[in-house]
Structure formats: C-alpha cells, structure tokens
C-alpha cells in the first residue's frame, strides 16, 4: 500500500523538515528559514512561532518542530502551549481588572496566580483550628478532642487531647 501510495503521490516520500515543492516538479525541498514541518508529506512548511514581548523562547524552532514559548519573569503561562501570558501577583493576592489586590479577610492564595480561596471551615469536618489562616495560607485543622477520645476512629487510635492556648478563628 505504501509503495502504491508513493507511486501515486510523490509527496508522501517527503520527510519531516521538508515540503513537496510543486514549483520544482514535486521535489522535496527543505523548509526555508523560520519555518518547519513536523510530519512527512507536507505541501507547505508552517511559519515558526516567534516569542516576542512578554513571551520568551523556551525551545528554538527547528526544521521539524515549532518554537515553544514561556513567559518572562513576573508573568505566567495561560492556555494551551502558553498562548497567553498573565501577570503574576504576590502570594496573598489575586489578579483583578484593576491589577493585583490583597485577598479579603477569610480568604487566601498561596500562589502567584489564581484567585483567593476561602479558609477551610474546620468544624464542617469535625476538626478544630490549630493555626489561624492568613492571606497567604489556609488555616491548619487538627483533630478535635472528640476525635482523640478513646474509641474514636483514626489512623492510630490516640487518647483524648486538650488543645494548647490559641485563639480560635
């Protein structure tokens, strides 16, 4: 089948990094500079992506593969193949239309991207707050005295607990 196909279509013999040049009797010609073909049998080469402005070259274009971009410091990639760069914020902030804004009380963001999320409500899971939350970090929940009492189920059944002096949330 491959043999038949190549007799019918000489272009199928053109490997990646080349194109089937109709202007030159369907001879396989190398891709011109700043272009590539990642598969065989191509009739044209694709233009290489250029990483300009806020984009930075992560991988140079070759005759067989496109360039890959990432973002300059202070920005992070969004979308498939880093199609966009979005401004970083500090931990404890989120990006809004008006720029980076601090997380509201009761929310946190432990990354330079994304949105502020609410602190965990420990009591919903039957736990106690051991360490209060901040803008940059969630609260720390721990076993409540009931969880640590004899007969309560846990990974290694411990005895009852009494929490140290800390201010509950």
């Amino acid at each position: 089948f491959e043999r038949t196909r190549s007799l019918q279509d000489p272009c199928s013999n053109c490997p990646a990094g080349t194109f089937c040049d109709n202007n030159r009797n369907q001879i396989c010609s190398p891709c011109p500079p700043n272009s590539f073909s990642s598969a065989g049998g191509q009739r044209t080469c694709d233009i290489c992506r250029q990483c300009k402005g806020v984009f930075r070259t992560r991988k140079e274009c070759s005759s067989t593969s496109n360039a890959e971009c990432d973002c300059t410091p202070g920005f992070h990639c969004l979308g498939a193949g880093c199609s966009m760069c979005e401004q970083d914020c500090k931990q404890g902030q989120e990006l809004t239309k008006k720029g980076c804004k601090d997380c509201c009380f009761g929310t946190f963001n432990d990354q330079k991207r994304g949105i502020c999320r609410p602190w965990t409500n420990c009591s919903l899971d039957g736990k106690s707050v051991l360490v209060n939350g901040t803008k940059e970090r969630d609260v720390v929940c721990g076993p409540s005295p009931a969880d640590l009492s004899p007969g309560a189920s846990s990974v290694t059944p411990p005895a009852p607990a009494r929490e140290p002096g800390h201010s509950p949330q």
Partner: nanobody
Framework: EVQLVESGGGLVQAGGSLRLSCAAS????????MAWYRQAPGNQRELVAV???????KYADTVKGRFTISRDNIKNTVNLEMNSLKPEDTAVYTC??????????WGQGTQVTVSS
C-alpha cells in the same frame, strides 16, 4: 498515606535538652500542618506544638519559650527541640501529619523521660 517514624527520645535530667525528629515516608508538603502530641501515663493526650506549611508555629502554654518546632518540606522531617526539660514533660511524644480534609496520620511515638 504518609508513614511517620519518631526518634530522639530517651532519659534526660531536669534542665537538659532533647531533639525529637519525625521522618515521613512521603511528601509532607501536601499536609497543612505537622504536629507533636504527647501523652503522660494517666493523662489525656495533648497538643504540644504545630507548624504550618510556611513555618508558622503554635505552642501549648506549658512549653512556650522552651520548645521549638520546625519542618523541612524538602527532607520531609519535623523536629521538636526541647530545652529546659521538666519532670512534667515526661510522656510519649507522637508526631502527626494534619490534612484539612481527610484523616490525620500518626506515628508510633517515642518515650521521653525527665528525671529530677
């Protein structure tokens, strides 16, 4: 679930120091808090100290100024530095890995005895 193994316990005279270490079998970075609990014979288990992912620590009033908890998210260890030990610090000290959602993982404990 992470496995925790404590070490460093032993017999020490009042006023002495010990350093307890808790080694985790896996990544502790995903745990919101790492803590040390203790239980003396006939007493309830009590929280001694807890350290959040960013190193923020809280202590029981009974150990404040004497004990220091720290965590190393790269080496997956949690240490408890215990100074100016008192006979009332005698207990089994147990390491715990705390997740805000899900169960708490516990070590088997290490005995600390402070003689007067």
């Amino acid at each position: 679930e992470v496995q925790l193994v404590e070490s460093g316990g032993g017999l020490v005279q009042a006023g002495g120091s010990l350093r307890l270490s808790c080694a985790a079998s896996g990544n502790i970075f995903s745990y919101n808090g790492m803590a040390w609990y203790r239980q003396a014979p006939g007493n309830q288990r009590e929280l001694v100290a807890v350290v959040a992912i960013d190193g923020t620590a809280k202590y029981a009033d009974t150990v404040k100024g004497r004990f220091t908890i720290s965590r190393d998210n790269i080496k997956n260890t949690v240490n408890l530095e215990m100074n100016s030990l008192k006979p009332e610090d005698t207990a089994v000290y147990t390491c715990a890995a705390l997740r805000n959602s899900g169960s708490t993982s516990w070590g088997q404990g290490t005995q600390v005895t402070v003689s007067s």
